[in-house]
Amino acid sequence: SLYVPCAPSPCVNGGTCRQTGDFTFECNCLPGFEGSTCERNIDDCPNHRCQNGGVCVDGVNTYNCRCPPQWTGQFCTEDVDECLLQPNACQNGGTCANRNGGYGCVCVNGWSGDDCSE
């Protein structure tokens, strides 16, 4: 049987095969893939833009940031409002104050401690 380089196509991940000679071929890869048969997903994480301790998770021609609990947003640069998430974060009439990367309690009537419980 006669070998035809692009039948069937050796290109994976959506790559397009082009015959370059009697027994040779070339794969044109979709964005995000590389290699002679487009077999490798390019790592998009080097020098990523995830901030505030966000962890980069590689995707196909993109990446996502997995943020620490106190941060959110595309690059972990939006502060999570813990006072909204935890309405009872401060005890004994204390007032919750949202801060970048966390929150604090303003205590009243002699109460103290992180959550005004002491």
Epitope: D44, P46, N47, R49, Q51, N52, G53, G59, V60, T62, N64, G73, Q74, F75, T77, E78, N100
Partner: antibody, heavy 117, light 112 residues
Framework: EVQLVQSGAEVKKPGESLKISCKGS????????IHWVRQMPGKGPEWTGY????????KFNEKFKGQATISVDKSSTTAYLQWSSLKASDTAMYYC??????????WGQGTLVTVSS | DVLMTQTPVSLPVSLGGQVSISCRSS???????????LHWFLQKPGQSPQLLIY???NRFSGVPDRFSGSGSGTDFTLKISRVEPEDLGVYYC?????????FGGGTKVEIK
Amino acid sequence: EVQLVQSGAEVKKPGESLKISCKGSGYTFSNYVIHWVRQMPGKGPEWTGYIIPGSGGTKFNEKFKGQATISVDKSSTTAYLQWSSLKASDTAMYYCARDGAGSFTYWGQGTLVTVSS
Amino acid sequence: DVLMTQTPVSLPVSLGGQVSISCRSSQSLVHSDGNTYLHWFLQKPGQSPQLLIYRISNRFSGVPDRFSGSGSGTDFTLKISRVEPEDLGVYYCLQSTHFPDTFGGGTKVEIK
């Protein structure tokens, strides 16, 4: 309060070198990348590149690769944009910026660079 | 790179009037995380750009409620319901879904 304060305007001749600065304050400097954005006269802004203060790693827009370098001094919370040999086409306003709610939430006041013989 | 096209390029307005600015992207701005990273900025004469709206429709802190954003996919709109003198300047859209971040060409809002 997040503040980015840039160095003053510069007038240079083609072929000369230049280093402009952007000092960040009011936040944890190492936690955020610093971007540089170019705005040529009468045009819209263009993202040039950024630096990660913690590692010193940089990422550039392909269009600007090899034209300038970005560096950082963590001790003075300052980022720099530097050219070794300026061209007339480098004439522009250069802004540093920091991410926040979206991309480029906080901006410096800009540094006007004029390159003319 | 993603091409961001703004229309109109220039927009003469009457104070107190309504303004609508369009921004179209050359490809969908829906990120793999499900969000759409389309933002709006205003650059007043002689000033740095300032963030107005992030992720299509969220007003940044201190931005008046006369500014609103809408849209999806590749088609986005910024509306100003009652134009005030401090609203004059050049408005830019920006996408940060795809690398590199790209701005639109701008829409200049000026007095009629």
